[in-house]
Interface confidence: low
């Protein structure tokens, strides 16, 4: 149940009033409005949309709405020199060229400023050479190639299929393998669900469709030229050679029609096993190079994109808190899109817009939240989470002292099967309790709670009786708040059935075919899933901003810490002899987790019993809850990743999208058997156990009685 108090409100102004005000029809209308033209970061169209949102949020009733601008490094194709890939014969003649653009969807033929498919931040270059097929270009795929198959990628152009991991990790892996160029493509095995037609007749990817995206390895840095500091008017900018995270080899994405032409000629080694085969009618030979008759032909890339410092605009709206105005609950999602943004991001932006409207309606009737709510429309998320990161860098001192929670609001849907939540363990109980109060939109669950349909369709893979809630990774705007600043964060959206749909993401992700019609015709005609996501995101914000005691349960952190400690210990125990040789012990970590569990349990007991009418004690207890997430931050950051500072969670070093637990220990243990100096490697494992144990113990002590 929501716990509200009188902040100049009438009794009806509770969570129910807020939720009842949310309307599917409004979300639909807002989505349509936001998707009629492209809103690429750094363009005039996206600046105009920022101003429109600013104006509408003011109309909705927020106390203030400001634009926050930054000048950051972005990347665009050269309008006069298009990017493409060719097959060249021994005379250097181009006998095949990939397409220069996606065929526009019906009704959009005359829209201007559709950016052609490109890999943002690719350097310029025209490498030519033999092709090597590297599957998904994951760490394990390169291990298979180099260690098992003895195939050397040095000096080769690699072709990798999209999916499984963040594209930036693919490029990094290819660089480390010595490749001189990367071709990324969407295989129907990953982006064409069986039994569904391709767009415009269904939600599948047509052969000419291509996924855009950045290929940076920023590791949380934000603008590549101003890591750690805002890209403001007086910023000192690094030279491009010192910029953070830029790829060093040309990269370009293609669709599966073009990929077919490259892959059908491949020779060399056969694929190592069936997991390397996609769904094209090609042999999926690894190479290097083309087969027999075509062995003299090469692949050539023509990449002419440019990196430019460009102005971006965030929209920041404020609804001042009545009791604790210096405590901030933030709801943020991005506004910039690759093209129309039918799903990414505007299905999320439309939901945020409706949430703002509902809060504004309550405010106009005399209500205020207990704590301040900040609403954000971020820019340049697609170019590396730049808008959110620069704003957080500019406001870091305020945020680390006042930030209660951050709720992310990118795409509201990636399917229409069930709910998907990633969040800090502090929010597990909030999410469980909220979803038990909301109605499920799912067919067959009429009259049942969202919690029931979610748990039924997406059970926890390890713990009975719970819906699956995943770890936060990255690849979205919560990154700086959670991984760098240690502000409790969460995200929620509707997703696909992962059991029956093995493709990666949704098929039309980052393509020109991600339109309003895609959503309205195929994903959510009644906008009931969008409404549910609005209720979850909005309900979380409402509770976080309005409940007298913060709705965080520190005991859930204790439970996962034990689970993560068990997991990392079991990974280490794959090397029992080395653990003995180098005296590696996890006792300190398990002891710290045990202490955390006991202290968290006692804190929770005190939380039930303390005098909530005493504002000093109430504030003290709430501050202990607010600062718990902060206590997991190591000011020195993770090795070689200074902006990933959370000791319990970080984006996986092998897949930015995925979260890893105890990442310092995990990375120290990863592939340790292949390290040249085992003594040094195991020494680093011991150091990371020490850092983790200390951090958990220190966090536990923040929950102890203060005196």
């Amino acid at each position: 149940k929501s716990s509200n108090e009188a902040t100049n409100i009438t009794p009806k102004h509770n969570m129910k009033a807020f939720l009842d005000e949310l309307k599917a029809e409004n979300i639909k209308k807002f989505l349509y409005n936001f998707t009629q033209i492209p809103h690429l970061a750094g363009t005039e169209q996206n600046f105009q949309l920022a101003k429109q949102i600013q104006s509408q949020w003011k109309e909705f009733g927020l106390d203030s709405v400001e634009l926050a601008h930054y000048d950051v490094l972005l990347s665009y194709p050269n309008k006069t020199h298009p990017n493409y890939i060719s097959i060249i014969n021994e005379d250097g003649n181009e006998i095949f060229n990939t397409s220069l653009f996606e065929p526009p969807p019906p009704g959009y033929e005359n829209v201007s400023d559709i950016v052609p498919p490109f890999s943002a931040f690719s350097p310029q270059g025209m490498p030519e050479g033999d092709l090597v097929y590297v599957n998904y270009a994951r760490t394990e795929d390169f291990f298979k190639l180099e260690r098992d198959m003895k195939i050397n990628c040095s000096g080769k152009i690699v072709i990798a299929r999209y999916g499984k991991v963040f594209r930036g990790n693919k490029v990094k892996n290819a660089q480390l393998a010595g490749a001189k160029g990367v071709i990324l493509y969407s295989d129907p095995a990953d982006y064409f669900a069986p039994g569904v037609k391709s767009y415009p007749d269904g939600w599948n990817l047509p052969g000419g469709g291509v996924q855009r995206g950045n290929i940076l390895n920023l590791n949380g840095a934000g603008d590549p030229l101003t890591p750690g500091y805002p890209a403001n008017e007086y910023a000192y900018r690094r030279g491009i050679a010192e910029a953070v995270g830029l790829p060093s080899i040309p990269v370009h994405p293609i669709g599966y029609y073009d990929a077919q032409k490259l892959l059908e000629k491949m020779g060399g080694s056969a694929p190592p096993d069936s997991s390397w085969r996609g769904s094209l009618k090609v042999p999926y030979n690894v190479g290097p190079g083309f087969t027999g008759n075509f062995s003299t032909q090469k692949v050539k890339m023509h990449i002419h994109s440019t990196n430019e410092v460009t102005r971006i605009y965030n929209v920041i709206g404020t609804l001042r808190g009545a009791v604790e105005p210096d405590r901030y609950v933030i709801l943020g999602g991005h506004r910039d899109s690759w093209v129309f943004g039918g799903i990414d991001p505007q299905s999320g932006a439309a939901v945020v817009h409706e949430i703002v409207r509902s809060f504004g309606t309550l405010k106009k009737e005399g209500w205020r939240p207990r704590r301040t709510i900040l609403f954000a429309s971020w820019d340049a998320e697609e170019f590396g989470l730049l808008g959110s990161t620069e704003w957080a860098e500019e406001n870091s001192r305020l945020l680390q002292e006042r930030g209660v929670a951050y709720i992310n609001a990118d795409s509201s849907i990636e399917g229409n099967y069930t709910l998907r939540v990633d969040c800090t363990p502090l929010m597990y109980s909030l999410v469980h309790n909220l979803t038990k109060e909301l109605k499920s939109p799912d067919e067959g669950f009429e009259g049942k709670s969202l919690y029931e349909s979610w748990t039924k369709k997406s059970p926890s893979p390890e713990f009975s009786g719970m819906p699956r809630i995943s770890k936060l990774g990255s690849g979205n705007d919560f990154e700086v708040f959670f991984q760098r600043l240690g502000i409790a964060s969460g995200r929620a959206r509707y997703t696909k059935n992962w059991e029956t749909n093995k493709f990666s993401g949704y098929p039309l992700y980052h393509s020109v075919y991600e339109t309003y019609e895609l959503v309205e015709k195929f994903y959510d005609p009644m906008f009931k899933y969008h409404l549910t996501v609005a209720q979850v995101r909005g309900g979380m914000v409402f509770e976080l901003a309005n409940s007298i005691v913060l709705p965080f349960d520190c005991r859930d952190y204790a439970v996962v810490l034990r689970k993560y400690a068990d997991k990392i210990y079991s990974i280490s125990m794959k090397h029992p002899q080395e653990m003995k040789t180098y005296s590696v012990s996890f006792d300190s970590l398990f002891s710290a987790v045990k202490n955390f569990t006991e202290i968290a349990s006692k804190f929770s007991e005190r939380l039930q019993d303390f005098d909530k009418s005493n504002p000093i004690v109430l504030r003290m207890m709430n501050d202990q809850l607010m600062f718990l997430e902060r206590a997991f931050i190591d000011p020195l950051g993770l090795p070689d990743r200074p902006f990933y500072r959370h000791v319990i969670y970080a984006p996986s070093s092998h897949n930015k999208y995925a979260g890893e637990s105890f990442p310092g220990i995990y990375d120290a243990l990863f592939d340790i058997e292949s390290k040249v100096d085992p003594s040094k490697a195991w020494g680093e494992v011991k150091r990371q156990i020490y850092v983790a144990a200390f951090t958990v113990q220190a966090a536990a002590e923040t929950l102890s009685e203060v005196a």
Epitope: S464, V559, R562
Partner: antibody, heavy 116, light 107 residues
């Protein structure tokens, strides 16, 4: 309807071996972790082993009492999970149940008797 | 290993009674506790998962509660078919462990 059918039990001498099978139907077998749980006559339940799904790299876990003597495996193409038991002892005598994920569905059990 | 201690080991009750069985974990197991019912000669059946959630098809007279180390299974309005042995079990960490069982007998 979820169905788990164990087979392969029987009488075996101490030190001998036995391979139990569990045929699954009614659910997407490859997505689920599988367990073996045993129960000696008139006694309580004892977890024996777990095998996770392909997405979890078929990770296996064993009870201390059987570690090094039993191997759990699975064949997703046959929707079957196995328990290979070696160096059997009299204290391994029990009904062996195959269960899905967190023991939410159980087979009818197969009896293993270790006796000379 | 985490010990799951059930009490009582047996209980005599009549049809219509309310029966309460407790399970104490030797360490915090969150809410990762399930309850099972077993009748002679048959396999156990899951009743409750996640400490308090009824499994599919389980009558509403069965309920579970608790978290961390103390858990309870309650059977309201005991029915003839409820006379059986009941086990708690934890799936929080390896090895998974069960309580020693509570036999509910006819008075």
């Amino acid at each position: 309807e979820v169905k788990l059918v164990e087979s392969g039990g029987g009488l075996v001498q101490p030190g001998g071996s036995l391979k139990l099978s569990c045929a699954a139907s009614g659910f997407t077998f490859s997505n689920y972790w599988m367990n073996w749980v045993r129960q000696a006559s008139g006694k309580g339940l004892e977890w024996v082993a777990e095998i996770r799904s392909q997405s979890n790299n078929f990770a296996t876990h064993y009870a201390e009492s059987v570690k090094g003597r039993v191997i759990i495996s699975r064949d997703d193409s046959k929707n079957t999970v196995y328990l290979q038991m070696n160096s059997l002892r009299t204290e391994d005598t029990a009904v062996y149940y195959c269960t899905r994920r967190w023991n939410n569905f159980w087979g009818q059990g197969t009896t293993v008797t270790v006796s000379s | 290993d985490i010990q799951m201690t059930q009490s009582p080991s047996s209980v005599s009750a009549s049809v219509g009674d309310r029966v309460t069985i407790t399970c104490k974990a030797s360490e915090n197991v969150g809410t990762y506790v399930s309850w099972y019912q077993q009748k002679p000669g048959t396999a156990p059946k899951m009743l409750i998962y996640g400490a308090s959630n009824r499994f599919t098809g389980v009558p509403s007279r069965f309920s579970g509660s608790g978290s961390a180390t103390d858990f309870t299974l309650t059977i309201n309005n005991l029915q003839p078919e409820d006379f059986a042995t009941y086990y708690c079990g934890q799936s929080y960490t390896f090895p998974y462990t069960f309580g020693q069982g509570t036999k509910v007998e006819i008075k």
